[in-house]
């Protein structure tokens, strides 16, 4: 069967949202009323992958526009960025490791770790309106924690 | 053998609250997400709420986004509905379901608790 | 949202009957389709889930096929256990909806 994707938002566990920042950079920050409508809506693709009851391999496309997390070397460091694509070809269910993340529930928290660079994750900073960028550390400063919230196509 | 038991139904006035709960056993209910499907008289079931196994995840269909929450103590084996702002659209039977972890089908059902919304 | 249409919404048949549903669904949800049986004031339960695989412990007198927009439950040899109701639901893309219900009566 093709790759499924179900329409979701992203909050930190700081509830801050996130938002586009430029055409090719994410950042959170709090919003409330109206304003939840600036929140970056994800397309999650179920994908292949190494998985477990509590990871699960997924890729996190942005709703209707040709572009997905994505996780590269830059300056010899792990990076994420947003990439575009080919809408002809993705999502689809073999996305290249780069693309990819092992969405991982721990408690009531979810953290999103790079399949590339094993233990880096989607993180944020304590600080608002900066960045989503990929950490290494986990418990320190930066936050990797986030939660869900599925939305109707 | 896997058991899903509703409790909390009963008669509410519309604008009033109601929290429904429901006790699992005979599964490890941490390592699964969980959903509330509700069915009102002579209507197609409709799904209403959805938690991941840790409730870090969610979902509510826009009929009730803003009015229901869903929450879950995986120490108690117990999932929760909590209900506000009821409408007497809202008068079905509420019945708790187990799902697998990536939100397809719900494999388990519990009997059902009725709720009435009515003055 | 994926609407979903059942046929009939009822049909009476005999024990020993061969009785198929269709269920049609308004975008293609490929083999994301599941079947659940309801007897009266009872819980639905699981019979079929991506389109054509039986749930444990269900008979293999039924049996689901199809893909895309068109799927069908059928059974083969109609039992007494299996007046009911039967109702399709997709989980393709969200909100997962239900088919209105087939009610199998006996004849």
């Known amino acids: 069967a093709p790759v499924r994707s179900l329409n979701c938002t992203l909050r930190d566990s700081q509830q801050k949202s996130l938002v586009m920042s430029g055409p090719y950079e994410l950042k959170a920050l709090h919003l409330q009323g109206q304003d939840m409508e600036q929140q970056v809506v994800f397309s999650m693709s179920f994908v292949q992958g190494e998985e477990s009851n509590d990871k699960i391999p997924v890729a996190l496309g942005l709703k209707e526009k040709n572009l997905y997390l994505s996780c590269v070397l830059k300056d010899d460091k792990p990076t994420l960025q947003l990439e575009s694509v080919d809408p002809k070809n993705y999502p689809k269910k073999k996305m290249e490791k780069r693309f990819v993340f092992n969405k991982i529930e721990i408690n009531n928290k979810l953290e999103f770790e790079s399949a590339q660079f094993p233990n880096w994750y989607i993180s944020t900073s304590q600080a608002e309106n900066m960045p989503v960028f990929l950490g290494g550390t986990k418990g320190g400063q930066d936050i990797t924690d986030f939660t869900m919230q599925f939305v109707s196509s | 053998e896997v058991q899903l038991v509703e409790s909390g139904g009963g008669l509410v006035q519309p604008g009033g609250s109601l929290r429904l709960s429901c006790a699992a056993s005979g599964f490890d209910f941490s390592r699964y997400d969980m959903s509330w499907v509700r069915q009102a008289p002579g209507k197609r079931l409709e799904w209403v709420a959805y938690i991941s196994s840790g409730g870090g995840s969610t979902y509510f269909p826009d009929t009730v986004k803003g009015r229901f929450t869903i929450s879950r103590d995986n120490a108690k084996n117990t999932l929760y509905l909590q209900m506000n702002s009821l409408r007497a659209e809202d008068t079905a039977v509420y019945y708790c379901a187990r799902q697998n972890k990536k939100l397809t089908w719900f494999d388990y059902w519990g009997q059902g608790t009725l709720v009435t919304v009515s003055s | 949202d994926i609407q979903m249409t059942q046929s009939p919404s009822s049909l009476s048949a005999s024990v020993g009957d061969r009785v198929t549903i269709t269920c049609r669904t308004s975008?293609?949800?490929?083999?994301?389709l599941t079947w659940y049986q309801q007897k009266p004031g009872k819980a639905p339960q699981l019979l079929v889930y991506?389109?054509?695989t039986l749930a444990d412990g269900v008979p293999s007198r039924f049996s689901g096929s199809g893909s895309g927009t068109q799927f069908t439950l059928t059974i083969s040899s109609l039992q007494p256990e299996d007046f009911a109701n039967y109702y399709c639901?997709?989980?393709?893309?969200?909100?997962?909806?239900f088919g209105q219900g087939t009610k199998v009566e006996i004849k």
């Open positions: 975008g293609n949800i490929h083999n994301y």
């Open positions: 991506n389109a054509k």
């Open positions: 639901q997709h989980f393709w893309s969200l909100p997962f909806t």
